[in-house]
């Protein structure tokens, strides 16, 4: 993704169009320290009772252009025997994130902030059993 070019003069923060002229630094800083990411477990997607797969969601007009999204493998959950339990459902946990979307045909490139729902994993919940009246 391209970065919004810096204007020669700082925009006036009191001007009505201030937010249309903000330069965004797209460098990603790991404020928690480098060690944190190495502890992030990647095998939960297989060990979970509601396992999921990850898909590489690509949008060249978005920043970040690559987002890895979870999708539940099954509608049901997996029991201790490795069989699907029809009393339990696999549901996607979604997180709302902010992304930058490139404005079409804009030159130089400008971005708008958009909300995006991203699947981050799956969890197991009890099925809703509807009793006959």
């Amino acid at each position: 993704a391209a970065i919004i070019p810096q204007s020669s003069a700082c925009p006036n923060t009191e001007a009505k169009d201030f937010l249309q002229n903000v330069k965004v630094n797209l460098k990603v800083f790991n404020s928690l320290g480098a060690k944190v990411s190495s502890r992030r477990p990647s095998d939960y997607l297989n060990r979970s009772t509601s396992p999921w797969t990850l898909h590489r969601n690509e949008d060249p007009d978005r920043y970040p252009s690559v987002i890895w999204e979870a999708q539940c493998r099954h509608q049901r959950c997996v029991n201790a025997e490795g069989k699907l339990d029809h009393h339990m459902n696999s549901v996607l946990i979604q997180q709302e994130i902010l992304v930058l979307k490139r404005e079409p045909e804009s030159c130089p490139f400008t971005f708008r902030v958009e909300k995006m729902l991203v699947g981050v994993g799956c969890t197991c919940v009890a099925s809703i059993v509807r009793q006959a009246a």
Epitope: V28, S37, S38, S42, T53, L54, R56
Partner: antibody, heavy 119, light 107 residues
């Protein structure tokens, strides 16, 4: 200093499988995607697929989806590319390369592994 | 798949010459194009990313330009160490694809 060190050359028979490794050092292994690219003798470069060691996610070029398997071992900071049902046209140099997901480009490459498929 | 058509496939030039290589994408790839240098028996080395940005440590004689479908890579004054093969590559959308390469030889 960032380094990607690949395993040595392999000679395989048609129908066999090969597993190439790529050991990373000098940065946090789980932070960046690993892509695999191959180059047949005298030919251009062909993208095979990608793995994100941080979350285990993979994506493949349609041409390799049925035969290539990408894995990563966080404990040794090593990425692997396994190619099955080898045929003579798979003879190539296989490269691993680090992709800066946010910036959007390949920066470091392994030295390459020559895989020769011959009966 | 996006096809990257690179030309010329080979080129003879002398030290000090200005050399230009072009790459044409089969559809718009915005500015998501990189240029690589590869010497025999070696892995590719990134020179230019996002069409016109020089990678860290790359000499200023290497430059790139273009957007959409047409891209240009220029070496302003050839040095002896520049004789190699050069590739363009798009990372706009997967499968990521490469040009067939331009072999730059000494005249």
């Amino acid at each position: 200093e960032v380094q990607l060190v690949q395993s040595g050359a392999e000679v395989k028979k048609p129908g066999a499988s090969v597993k190439v490794s790529c050991k990373a050092s000098g940065y946090t292994f789980t932070d960046y995607e690993f892509h695999w690219v191959r180059q047949a003798p005298g030919q251009g470069l062909e993208w095979i697929g990608v793995i994100h060691p941080g979350n285990g996610g993979t994506a493949y070029n349609q041409n390799f989806r049925d035969r290539a398997t990408l894995t990563a071992d966080k404990s040794t900071s090593t990425a692997y590319m396994e190619l099955s049902s080898l045929r003579s046209e798979d003879t190539a140099v296989y490269y691993c390369t680090r992709f800066l997901t946010y910036e959007g480009y390949f920066d470091y490459w392994g030295q390459g592994t020559l895989v020769t498929v011959s009966s | 798949n996006i096809v990257m058509t690179q030309s010329p496939s080979s080129l003879s030039a002398s030290v000090g010459d200005r050399v230009t290589i072009t790459c044409k994408a089969s559809q718009s790839v915005s500015i998501d194009v990189g240029w690589f240098q590869q010497k025999p028996g070696k892995s590719p080395k990134l020179l230019i990313y996002h069409a016109s940005n020089r990678y860290t440590g790359v000499p200023s004689r290497f430059s790139g330009s273009g957007s959409g479908t047409d891209f240009t890579f220029t070496i302003s004054s050839l040095q002896p160490e520049d004789f190699a093969t050069y590739f363009c590559q798009q990372d706009y959308s997967s499968p990521y694809t490469f040009g067939q390469g331009t072999k730059l030889e000494i005249k």
